[in-house]
Amino acid sequence: MKVLQEPTCVSDYMSISTCEWKMNGPTNCSTELRLLYQLVFLLSEAHTCIPENNGGAGCVCHLLMDDVVSADNYTLDLWAGQQLLWKGSFKPSEHVKPRAPGNLTVHTNVSDTLLLTWSNPYPPDNYLYNHLTYAVNIWSENDPADFRIYNVTYLEPSLRIAASTLKSGISYRARVRAWAQCYNTTWSEWSPSTKWHNSYREPFEQ
């Protein structure tokens, strides 16, 4: 049994890091493998992650971590029984994929303005809370070409757009994702999308 593709990990910079790797053949990850991880710190204890299958030869493990900060560095040991298959390390702050924003809501009752709001996925005491910026994707269910991205570079998790910038009388969907420049993160996954019917009063033509 050998590791074909070494583990690569990403952290949500809060409580979970996800590591993925590939073996050289079909593997029952949960029964044959264990990923041990330990913070390089005074008094830290070793933890064991039981991997799940991710395709025939692929494995994925969700590592639980408390109180993640920049200085944290973890040792990783991948075991098959008594055999050490791979040894490495992982610094969560250098491989951050933020959590996806939640509770995306479209408020259509503000005079011909669409107000989109969503929730910051981090608690206020997490460093990323004040450093997320967002991308909002709006698209028409009827017209695949009617697809737009709005970059929200301020901290407020909201976006206002004139309803008239979208077509009237048709349904639209929106979703939002986040990233943080300070840690050079990847983009988060998209939030679940929300749907609304866009209608507004056309101005009278003179």
Epitope: F41, L42, L43, S44, E45, D66, D67, V69, S70, A71, D72, D125
Partner: antibody, heavy 116, light 111 residues
Framework: QVQLVQSGAEVKKPGASVKVSCKAS????????MHWARQAPGQGLEWMGI????????SYAQKFQGRVTMTRDTSTSTVYMELSSLRSEDTAVYYC?????????WGKGTLVTVSS | QSVLTQPPSVSAAPGQKVTISCSGG????????VSWYQQLPGTAPKLLIY???KRPSGIPDRFSGSKSGTSATLAITGLQTGDEADYYC????????????FGTGTKLTVL
């Protein structure tokens, strides 16, 4: 919100022991390390040791080895710091502080006076 | 005895800028992250800067931190009378299984 509430001031005689408590609230007690530091009057901060509330393991500054004991009670989310064989130079304010590499939350401090 | 050296005192007038240095070595600052604490008279220390240059929420951007080699610096701009306090740098010693260490402390006087 996170709170660390320390026990009240103590006056002790040389040679005696003192046990200072630090009750934590507003977070998952076993998920965060707790440190103890002290500050003698007009002096700087001095680290004493650390306890991992999850398993109760400890590590102490060499200066206090053999004289200090840190324990925790998970049922009450409280950590304790006991210092024995007290001498006059142990007169100080003793702080508990939550964190790993740096400490964002501190108790208000407990003044321990050692005097004959 | 602290192995992180700070100037005993610094002073400046309101509105001015002041810097406080913290000098260490390769087994501490040179190989670690630095934090800074403010201690107002009669109170517990308060975290001002962590991870060399990050501010906890609620700390104004008048406070900034930097690190270069085996030294770190705290800068305070737009000095206010309420900034008069003792300031401590902190890091950990990689030669003693990550035991924390503090600087000697600096008394800031706002003239």
């Amino acid at each position: 919100q996170v709170q660390l509430v320390q026990s009240g001031a103590e006056v002790k005689k040389p040679g005696a022991s003192v046990k200072v408590s630090c009750k934590a609230s507003g977070y998952a007690f076993t998920s965060y390390y707790m440190h103890w530091a002290r500050q003698a009057p007009g002096q700087g901060l001095e680290w004493m040791g650390i306890i991992n509330p999850s398993g109760g393991s400890t590590s102490y500054a060499q200066k206090f080895q053999g004289r200090v004991t840190m324990t925790r009670d998970t049922s009450t989310s409280t950590v304790y710091m006991e210092l024995s064989s007290l001498r006059s130079e142990d007169t100080a304010v003793y702080y508990c502080a939550r964190g790993k590499w740096w400490w964002q939350h501190w108790g208000k401090g407990t003044l321990v006076t050692v005097s004959s | 005895q602290s192995v992180l050296t700070q100037p005993p005192s610094v002073s400046a007038a309101p509105g001015q800028k002041v810097t406080i240095s913290c000098s260490g070595g390769s087994s501490n600052i040179g190989n670690s992250y630095v934090s800074w604490y403010q201690q107002l008279p009669g109170t517990a220390p308060k975290l001002l800067i962590y991870d060399n240059n990050k501010r906890p929420s609620g700390i104004p951007d008048r406070f900034s931190g930097s690190k270069s080699g085996t030294s770190a610096t705290l800068a305070i701009t737009g000095l206010q009378t309420g900034d008069e306090a003792d300031y401590y740098c902190g890091t950990w010693d990689t030669s003693t299984t990550y035991h924390p260490i503090f600087g000697t402390g600096t008394k800031l006087t706002v003239l």
